[in-house]
């Protein structure tokens, strides 16, 4: 029995609903009474949702899943997952048994956009060319882990003396703190770019130091 799922991962934003598509080709004369459908976590075989004996057996996964009952008879075994969480990320197997068996796995990739970075400077006053300063770029509540890039006002990448830390909160979302240590020139702009690799979303922050005072656009 051929079971079809998308090859590419399904990308879902945290808090939204996702549809994990799965389909099979019913033979002529097929009735739902013959169908055994199981959605399970691929890595653990933990039951997510099932359909058996012509009846939806319900969600075994935090009551956040649903089938599309009106479409099952046409071979649509897709699963709706509500209020997606970081912990939902992974592979889900769609297992169909009629007379024959078939299964396929679909990947769920969870994502959350990063906030616009906030920039802080230490020390933040009485700065002169030649002083060493620490610039911190902070961006919050994104997923998965971010890629962080620094550059100067001319667009030249700054890779030395950068320390980036990412901490997950209870929901699994990451707060990113990236610290750049730099020796000040006469004046300059320092930009931080926080990229979400799944969403291909960039969040920018910059600080411009022009002698006195400093500006934070």
């Amino acid at each position: 029995l051929e079971v079809q799922v998308p090859e590419d991962p399904v990308v879902a934003l945290v808090g939204t609903d996702a549809t994990l598509c799965c389909s099979f080709s019913p033979e002529p004369g097929f009735s739902l009474a013959q169908l055994n459908l199981i959605w399970q976590l691929t890595d653990t075989k933990q039951l997510v949702h099932s359909f058996a004996e012509g009846q939806d057996q319900g969600s075994a996964y935090a009551n956040r899943t649903a089938l599309f009952p009106d479409l099952l008879a046409q071979g649509n075994a897709s699963l709706r997952l509500q209020r997606v969480r970081v912990a939902d990320e992974g592979s889900f197997t769609c297992f169909v048994s009629i007379r024959d068996f078939g299964s396929a796995a679909v990947s769920l990739q969870v994502a959350a956009p990063y906030s616009k970075p906030s920039m802080t400077l230490e020390p933040n006053k009485d700065l002169r060319p030649g002083d060493t300063v620490t610039i911190t770029c902070s961006s919050y509540r994104g997923y998965p882990e971010a890629e962080v890039f620094w550059q100067d006002g001319q667009g030249v990448p700054l890779t030395g003396n950068v320390t980036t830390s990412q901490m997950a909160n209870e929901q699994g979302l990451f707060d990113v703190h990236s610290v750049l240590r730099v020796v000040l020139g006469a004046n300059g702009t320092y930009s931080c770019l926080v990229r979400n690799p799944v969403l291909q979303q960039d969040a920018h922050g910059s600080v411009t130091i022009t002698g006195q005072p400093m500006t934070f656009p």
């Epitope: 075989k45 297992f95 048994s97």
Partner: antibody, heavy 118, light 109 residues
């Protein structure tokens, strides 16, 4: 030809340890879940433990939990069962079995005998 | 006591039809594949039927069916070489374990 070959059984005293191995051949070992099933003399089949294809998920029967450890080495196509604190009631023939995507243990080894006795 | 319930014994004469039942629950047979194994004396178990599917090499005298939380194995045209122990088995979602029936000893009279 798809084959599973168990080894490592023998006579051991109560409280002792033993490590069983199951060498797989003729299929892509790293793609399959695997299980250990045992059969005490004159008794029925009893599932002991199972492990996912990557080794990240493991399951155990209540009767062996905390005493037995299942593991695998996909580079060597080998499944293991480390048995500690053995008891007389662990005496059995131990079979390894391939566990496919459709929840079928479809291929079994010939078994290795474990005897726990003083 | 086994999670899946099978009769301890069954018998028939050559050529007869014999059925063996296996009763479980919604967390195993009710939604998971039910497997039937044949174990000839002194040998390892051999997969016979999964739900109603026969692996290649298994004679079509053997058939399986499943309804609700019960399953049955039927053997038609019974032969002396069918004398063996037969086990049903299924994955159980509540126990996170494989569960077996206690086994049915089939005697060919």
């Amino acid at each position: 030809e798809v084959q599973l070959l168990e080894s490592g059984g023998g006579l051991v005293q109560p409280g002792g340890s033993l490590r069983l191995s199951c060498a797989a051949s003729g299929f892509t070992f790293s793609s399959y879940w695997m299980s250990w099933v045992r059969q005490a003399p004159g008794k029925g089949l009893e599932w002991v433990s199972g492990i996912s294809s990557s080794g990240s998920a493991t399951y155990y029967a209540d009767s062996v939990k905390g005493r037995f450890t299942i593991s695998r080495d996909n580079s060597k196509n080998t499944l293991y069962l480390q048995m500690n604190s053995l008891r007389a009631e662990d005496t059995a023939v131990y079979y390894c079995a391939r566990w496919n995507d459709y929840d079928i243990m479809d291929v079994w080894g010939q078994g290795t005998t474990v005897t726990v006795s003083s | 006591q086994s999670v899946l319930t099978q009769p301890p014994s069954a018998s028939g004469t050559p050529g007869q039809r014999v059925t063996i039942s296996c009763s479980g629950s919604s967390s195993n047979i009710g939604r998971r594949t039910v497997n039937w194994y044949q174990q000839l004396p002194g040998t390892a178990p051999k997969l016979l039927i999964s739900n109603s599917q026969r692996p290649s090499g298994v004679p079509d005298r053997f058939s399986g069916s499943k309804s609700g939380t019960s399953a049955s194995l039927a053997i038609t045209g019974l032969q002396s070489e069918d004398e063996a122990d037969y086990y049903c088995a299924s994955w159980d979602d509540s126990l996170n374990a494989w569960v077996f029936g206690g086994g049915t000893k089939l005697t060919v009279l």
